[in-house]
């Protein structure tokens, strides 16, 4: 029927989003290059660089990684976007000055075990949760 | 002992972070105003504004909300920061050109129920997960 056809068009069209976004994502730059889509980046963190070498015994550092990149319309499946992020992306297209894009944040985090001195100089082995980024997504 | 005193200083000092950050966070501006800390902002989303009025029967819209604000050093308890975000904040202080600040993202999301027409014009009631931001944090 005409109404269901109109609904289909409405679904596909999502207002002006598609055309707007093609331009919008093409003009999102970081340092004059196209800023890549939200993804995990490798990052090794040295505890000495953080000034923690006097109380952390081991490890000397770890692969923490971090998330960075654009969460631009359309959000692909590999961007692990929540329903809210999908809605926010569309709202941002309509009101870019007022509502930010969703941000690229960790979706999976792992723990690491750390051997350290406590305040009384006791040696402690402790598992620290949410230390390593395993995966990123648009949130 | 001297070594435990040094460890305590090291914990407090986090290399240059402490002094740097006091200034750095005081000078984080967005368009010449101080950008507020990461928090939940109210946002009502109208399905008509998204062009979805022809297939969503009810509700007409909903309070989606969104997260925005700075995740600057030091990350306070109310920022719901992960251990990784705390580490990343310190790394950003040392490497601002290369490692971004953690981002302000939803930490609690709620579902909403939506009554809509499917592709065959059947009326469906479906619960959509992760549609409403309840709380935000630095990730």
């Amino acid at each position: 029927s005409a109404s269901s056809r109109r609904r289909q068009q409405s679904r596909n069209r999502s207002t002006q989003s598609q055309d707007v976004a093609r331009v919008s994502s093409a003009s999102d730059y970081n340092s004059s290059e196209l800023k890549t889509a939200c993804r995990k980046h490798e990052l090794y963190v040295s505890f000495q660089d953080l000034g923690w070498q006097d109380w952390i015994i081991a490890p000397k550092g770890y692969a923490a990684n971090y998330c960075d990149g654009e969460c631009s319309f359309p959000l692909n499946a590999h961007m692990n976007a929540t329903n809210h992020a999908i809605v926010q992306t569309l709202v941002h297209l309509m009101n870019p000055e007022y509502v930010p894009k969703p941000c690229c944040a960790p979706t999976k985090l792992n723990a690491i075990s750390v051997l350290y001195f406590d305040d009384n100089s006791n040696v402690i082995l402790k598992k620290y949760r949410n230390m390593v980024v395993r995966a990123c997504g648009c949130h | 002992s001297a070594s435990s005193r040094r460890r305590q200083q090291s914990r407090n000092r986090s290399t240059q972070s402490q002094d740097v950050a006091r200034v750095s966070s005081a000078s984080d501006y967005n368009s010449s105003e101080l950008k507020t800390a990461c928090r939940k902002h109210e946002l009502y989303v109208s399905f008509q504004d998204l062009g979805w009025q022809d297939w969503i029967i009810a509700p007409k819209g909903y309070a989606a909300n969104y997260c925005d604000g700075e995740c600057s050093f030091p990350l306070n308890a109310h920022m719901n920061a992960t251990n990784h975000a705390i580490v990343q904040t310190l790394v950003h202080l040392m490497n601002p050109e290369y490692v971004p600040k953690p981002c302000c993202a939803p930490t609690k999301l709620n579902a909403i129920s939506v009554l809509y027409f499917d592709d065959n014009s059947n009326v469906i009631l479906k619960k959509y997960r992760n549609m409403v931001v309840r709380a935000c944090g630095c990730h």
Partner: antibody, heavy 117, light 108 residues
Framework: QVQLVESGGGLVRPGGSLRLSCAAS????????MSWIRQAPGKGLEWVSY????????YYADSVKGRFTISRDNARDSLYLQMNSLRAEDTAVYYC??????????WGQGTLVTVSS | EIVLTQSPGTLSLSPGERATLSCRAS???????LAWYQQKPGQAPRLLIY???SRATGIPDRFSGSGSGTDFTLTISRLEPEDFAVYCC?????????FGQGTKVEIK
């Protein structure tokens, strides 16, 4: 007071090598990231490289990547820049600078590197 | 990379006058991560301002920085004889870090 003294500059032929050194004093060297910045004659400043406290994090400008190597010896309070495959466009005064959260709060007087045949 | 363009190239002023130096970025500088340095012939650069508006230790209060986004300004409220030098801006919010070409403040 904080002091940074560069050495090792001089005249070298294109394709040649030089090793610059920077001796630090007046502060705890092992608490700071360090950097090399250069200035070609009559031109502006150009960032070359920086190194973290432990030496585990290092970044280079694209113009020197693969040719220059930054290193440090915290026991000797020293920063180094090994420059290989030198080109005429590498001619500049090379400054060693102490880095604090992205900016440079103390600089040495510089050492001149001239690459010419 | 972010290109920093300083203007004017040369500023001819007398002691006691106010100097206003501009630094324009080709893209927005994140978190106002911009510094200003002073350089005299044959000398090392000296840090004046960081974070766009925070004065470095020991810098007189006649030096002030302002701006955000792509437009930044260094103001010297009353020029002293020792202020005649080259001034350079530097962004450290995006890789690679970059510097402006400098503005020379000379005695009129």
């Amino acid at each position: 007071q904080v002091q940074l003294v560069e050495s090792g500059g001089g005249l070298v032929r294109p394709g040649g090598s030089l090793r610059l050194s920077c001796a630090a004093s007046g502060f705890t060297f092992s608490d700071y990231y360090m950097s090399w910045i250069r200035q070609a004659p009559g031109k502006g400043l150009e960032w070359v490289s920086y190194i973290s406290i432990s030496g585990s994090t290092i970044y280079y400008a694209d113009s020197v990547k693969g040719r220059f190597t930054i290193s440090r010896d915290n026991a000797r309070d020293s920063l180094y820049l090994q420059m290989n495959s030198l080109r005429a466009e590498d001619t500049a005064v090379y400054y060693c600078a102490r880095r604090t959260s992205g900016w440079y709060d103390f600089w040495g007087q510089g050492t001149l590197v001239t690459v010419s045949s | 990379e972010i290109v920093l363009t300083q203007s004017p190239g040369t500023l001819s002023l007398s002691p006691g006058e106010r100097a206003t130096l501009s630094c324009r970025a080709s893209q927005s500088v994140s978190y106002r991560y911009l510094a200003w340095y002073q350089q005299k012939p044959g000398q090392a650069p000296r840090l004046l301002i960081y974070g766009a508006s925070s004065r470095a230790t020991g810098i007189p209060d006649r030096f002030s920085g302002s701006g955000s986004g792509t437009d930044f300004t260094l103001t010297i409220s009353r020029l002293e004889p020792e202020d005649f030098a080259v001034y350079c801006c530097h962004q450290y919010g995006s890789s690679p870090p970059t510097f402006g070409q400098g503005t020379k403040v000379e005695i009129k």
